[in-house]
């Protein structure tokens, strides 16, 4: 479980077709 102070930060993961992109790479989302 994330610490409360972390919850408003984006979490970054590797994924494909994420973050409005067609390829694979890092994507950070709140």
């Amino acid at each position: 479980r994330r610490r409360r102070r972390d919850t408003h930060f984006p979490i970054c993961i590797f994924c494909c077709g994420c973050c409005h992109r067609s390829k694979c790479g890092m994507c950070c989302k709140t």
Epitope: P10, I13, C24, G25, M26, C28
Partner: antibody, heavy 121, light 107 residues
Framework: QVQLVESGGGVVQPGRSLRLSCAAS????????MHWVRQAPGKGLEWVAV????????YYADSVKGRFTISRDNSKNTLYLQMNSLRAEDTAVYYC??????????????WGQGTMVTVSS | SYELTQPPSVSVSPGQTATITCSGD??????ACWYQQRPGQSPVLVIY???KRPSGIPERFSGSNSGNTATLTISGTQAMDEADYFC??????????FGGGTKLTVL
């Protein structure tokens, strides 16, 4: 100007520990992911670890997982790498590098000058 | 395990075009970046997201990436371009790969 300055390198015996620091200036440190990348003498680049915006969101290369810990202190604009159980193969120049801004930070857009770590008995 | 493969060295005459390749399994499905490292200096980002140039990088640097190969092209190569060049791509959240590096010599 945007700058990253590493410190804490030196000569250390196998099995011992060392902590590297990277002081950031010229940008909003808390708004960027930060990496450690190393380069053995005469060799190529090897990614070591990344810490994203949240302290809990960090990843390590298999070669250092369980031995190295990346952390950051946003109030001090400083990135750290705690290196335990050091091995001869950890000998390298260690660079801190800033992750690109934005929602898709694939690249390392700013690099420090590096600090040399030598593991030798 | 994945790896990115680059030719150890490439030679080019001043004013000519230098082409440096980076090969890896399904590399074209990932975004590739390129870094320049002059002797004794830190790496500098020259291409990101396959084809984009950071501000301050000359237009003579360009990139492409499809299939299993990413390519860095330097048009009108200058003596100051002599350096090591490294490709880089993400293969997972815990696997950021760099190529072994290519030494560009401007004859």
């Amino acid at each position: 100007q945007v700058q990253l300055v590493e410190s804490g390198g030196g000569v250390v015996q196998p099995g011992r520990s060392l902590r590297l620091s990277c002081a950031a200036s010229g940008f909003t440190f808390s708004s960027y992911g930060m990496h450690w990348v190393r380069q053995a003498p005469g060799k190529g680049l090897e990614w070591v670890a990344v810490i994203w915006y949240a302290e809990s969101n960090k990843y390590y290369a298999d070669s250092v997982k369980g031995r190295f810990t990346i952390s950051r202190d946003n109030s001090k604009n400083t990135l750290y790498l705690q290196m335990n159980s050091l091995r001869a193969e950890d000998t390298a120049v260690y660079y801190c590098a800033r992750a690109q801004e934005g929602i898709a930070p694939d690249a390392f857009d700013i690099w420090g000058q590096g600090t040399m770590v030598t593991v030798s008995s | 395990s994945y790896e990115l493969t680059q030719p150890p060295s490439v030679s080019v005459s001043p004013g000519q075009t230098a082409t440096i390749t980076c090969s890896g399994d399904k590399l074209g499905e990932r975004y590739a970046c390129w870094y320049q490292q002059r002797p004794g200096q830190s790496p500098v980002l020259v291409i990101y997201q396959d084809i984009k140039r950071p501000s301050g990088i000359p237009e003579r640097f360009s990139g492409s990436n499809s299939g299993n190969t990413a390519t860095l092209t330097i048009s009108g190569t200058q003596a100051m371009d002599e350096a090591d060049y490294f490709c880089q791509a993400w293969y997972s959240s815990t696997n950021v790969l760099f190529g072994g590096g290519t030494k560009l010599t401007v004859l």
